[in-house]
Interface confidence: medium
């Protein structure tokens, strides 16, 4: 079980460090999406675990950005990032058979809403109980 | 430009308690991006890390060192400080505060103060 | 704890490549951090993580970690790289941080 969740860790190190850098290999973005946006996680232990994606980054070195897949809704009152830019992608993560391109990377600035819990307590959780 | 610097006395004698802070300017303490950390460097010898402590106030410490130390943070101050109970001259060091950054893959101090050289002596 | 191991003292030529090394369990789930220490100053760091190099630190210095070995590399050493590196990782509880006891590195 060990080497499981090592593997499992360098795998999803790599799907977050090249997040959104292919448009035609999105299955591993999609996979771990979803991961986030079921557990309601983010990261593998930590959020912060995204900043340091190349593509995710905002132009000020405190301006983070993070997948749609991190927002926690109920937590978030601006209906205009909510209408526009979080429910258009979080709808997406109800229907993975459609194929996400790489515009539809969904990056808008992070902190407050999103959720900051990782994701790596509850997967190995999971891992343990299948 | 995030800076951070150390102050406290220069001399301590042995059993006493030694109290040092770290004055943060350019970043929020209040960040649950960051950890933030104290350092010390015995004269001529190499880093030990002594401990850490995040904007929610956990805190974690050095478990080779005894458990001596302990790390607040008074965020409303910007500052965040280090005790040292019952010093011994094995304290003699140079004290350094440091921020950390978050991430599950490596762990790093991006920012350090000057450092403050601590004495103990009678 | 976990404990990270450095060689005390390496040594290279101007000019020439050198590899520190950095060994220890907790580096099979961690990487390193790079930190170089000229004397009476603070560390600062010059490598951390897969291949991150902070701003303003020359493109000579490089990382890489195979199994329990994380190694920081100077590719054509400058008489201004003479200092003490320490390597620095999380240890293998995740909670605890722990600094190798720090390479001397002398240009001749």
């Known amino acids: 079980r060990a080497q499981l969740e090592r593997s499992l860790r360098d795998v999803v190190e790599k799907t977050i460090q090249k997040y959104g850098t292919n448009p035609e290999e999105t299955a591993a973005e999609e996979s771990w999406d979803y991961v986030q946006f079921q557990l309601r996680c983010c990261g593998w232990h930590y959020p912060q675990d995204w900043f340091q994606v190349l593509i995710l980054r905002g132009n000020g070195s405190e301006a983070h950005r993070v997948p749609c897949s991190c927002y926690n809704l109920s937590a978030t009152n601006d209906s205009t990032i909510l209408d526009k830019v979080i429910l258009p992608q979080l709808s997406r993560l109800g229907h993975l058979a459609r194929s996400r391109h790489s515009a539809d990377i969904c990056a808008v600035p992070a902190e407050s809403h999103i959720y900051r819990e990782g994701c790596a307590q509850g997967l190995q959780k999971w891992l343990h109980n299948n | 430009q995030v800076q951070l610097q150390e102050s406290g006395p220069g001399l301590v004698k042995p059993s006493e308690t030694l109290s040092l802070s770290c004055t943060v300017s350019?970043?929020?303490?209040?960040?649950?991006?960051?950890?933030w950390g104290w350092v010390r460097q015995p004269p001529g010898k190499g880093l030990e890390w002594i401990g850490t402590?995040?904007?929610?106030?956990?805190?974690y410490y050095n478990p080779s060192l005894k458990s001596r130390f302990t790390i607040s943070v008074a965020t409303s101050k910007n500052q965040f400080s280090l005790r040292l109970s019952s010093v011994t001259a094995a304290d003699t060091a140079v004290y350094y505060c440091?921020?950390?950054?978050?991430?599950?893959?490596?762990?790093?101090?991006?920012?350090w103060g000057q450092g403050t050289l601590v004495t103990v002596s009678s | 704890s976990s404990e990270l191991t450095q060689d005390p003292a390496v040594s290279v030529a101007l000019g020439q490549t050198v590899r520190i090394t950095c060994q220890g369990d907790?580096?099979?789930?961690?990487?390193a951090s790079w930190y170089q220490q000229k004397p009476g100053q603070a560390p600062v760091l010059v490598f951390y993580?897969?291949?991150n190099r902070p701003s303003g630190i020359p493109d000579r210095f490089s990382g890489s970690t195979s199994g329990n070995t994380a190694s920081l590399t100077i590719t054509g050493a400058q008489a201004q790289d003479e200092a003490d590196y320490y390597c620095?990782?999380?240890?293998?509880?995740?909670?605890?941080?722990?600094f190798g006891g720090g390479t001397k590195l002398t240009v001749l």
């Open positions: 440091a921020r950390g950054y978050r991430n599950s893959w490596y762990a790093l101090f991006e920012y």
């Open positions: 350019g970043g929020s303490l209040n960040s649950y991006n960051y950890y």
């Open positions: 402590i995040y904007s929610s106030g956990s805190a």
């Open positions: 907790s580096l099979r789930n961690y990487y």
């Open positions: 993580g897969k291949d």
């Open positions: 620095n990782s999380r240890d293998s509880s995740g909670d605890h941080l722990v």
